[in-house]
Interface confidence: medium
């Protein structure tokens, strides 16, 4: 099943101590999915979308080994035929650097 969209959402972090907010969204025909956020291949957080929503926002507190950095990926799972869990492809990566680049 298709990969989710992933993006960093405001307010953007400006230092290691700031929280990171990462939104992850499944395609329109997969509301209520279970989402997993990975950092460098390690599971950071699990969230389930409400049944009428296609995505979640992961809120990561600053100052911990599980927070700033990256690359972050997300993935979602849905129940398919015969109630078997199906996992999506991984999203594109999102990297977070400090301070947030201004190009």
């Amino acid at each position: 099943i298709p990969a989710p969209s992933i993006r960093l959402v405001p307010p953007y972090p400006s230092s290691q101590e700031d929280p990171i907010h990462i939104a992850c969204m499944a395609p329109g025909n997969f509301p209520g999915a279970n989402f997993t956020l990975y950092r460098g291949g390690q599971v950071v957080q699990l969230l389930q979308a409400p049944t009428d929503q296609r995505g979640v926002t992961f809120n990561l507190s600053g100052g911990s080994s599980k927070a700033p950095g990256g690359p972050f990926h997300c993935q979602y799972g849905v129940l398919g035929e015969l109630n078997q869990s199906q996992l999506s492809d991984l999203s594109e990566p999102v990297n977070v650097s400090f301070p947030v680049p201004t190009w």
């Epitope: 960093l8 969204m25 929503q53 995505g55 979640v56 926002t57």
Partner: antibody, heavy 127, light 107 residues
Amino acid sequence: EVQLVQSGAEVKKPGESLKISCKGSGYSFTNYWIHWVRQMPGKGLEWMGIIDPGNSFTRYSPSFQGQVTISADKSISTAYLQWSSLKASDTAMYYCARGDGLYGGSDGYSMGGFDNWGQGTLVTVSS
Amino acid sequence: DIQMTQSPSSLSASVGDRVTITCRASQTIWNYLAWYQQKPGKAPKLLIYDASNLQSGVPSRFSGSGSGTDFTLTISSLQPEDFATYYCQQYSHFPHTFGQGTKVEIK
């Protein structure tokens, strides 16, 4: 087929109220946000505001805050834009558009461009 | 509000020409930028989202690039149906804002 169908053109007098509509079909209405965009005659596009039909979360551009109200009735897959007291300067084409959205904490985030648009509703306000 | 400045405001070109339109944001918007095409009397049409992703069904002669504050829409070989007005739009921050538009006319 995804469609957004807007209500027909309106001619109103200054001070009158108005509510125009945007009906979605061909997709799950509560899974996408609805944006409203104004285009005054011969001018560019102006983003007015947004509604998440699933939970009626709204955000307005400061330019339109307090001037219009955006609402939705998910039971009939319809979003609305309304004025309580029209002005001549409200004369414009108004478009609704579908966009990916996500509700996060106390704020909402848009996730991409507006992939489907209504045909537009022309509102003319003249005495 | 984030200001979006497009240039040029209008241009004249011939069929087959390579056309480039630029859009500059007043502050960083990462890659959260879309491009639209609008023809007279019609609703806008999404061409590009996330700065460089081609919307389904849009011809591959359209492409987008850029990140941060500076973005470009390129039409590699202008076709007769491409004469229209083009708008950029940022969706990094509320309120979402559009550029003022670039009108592409026949030379």
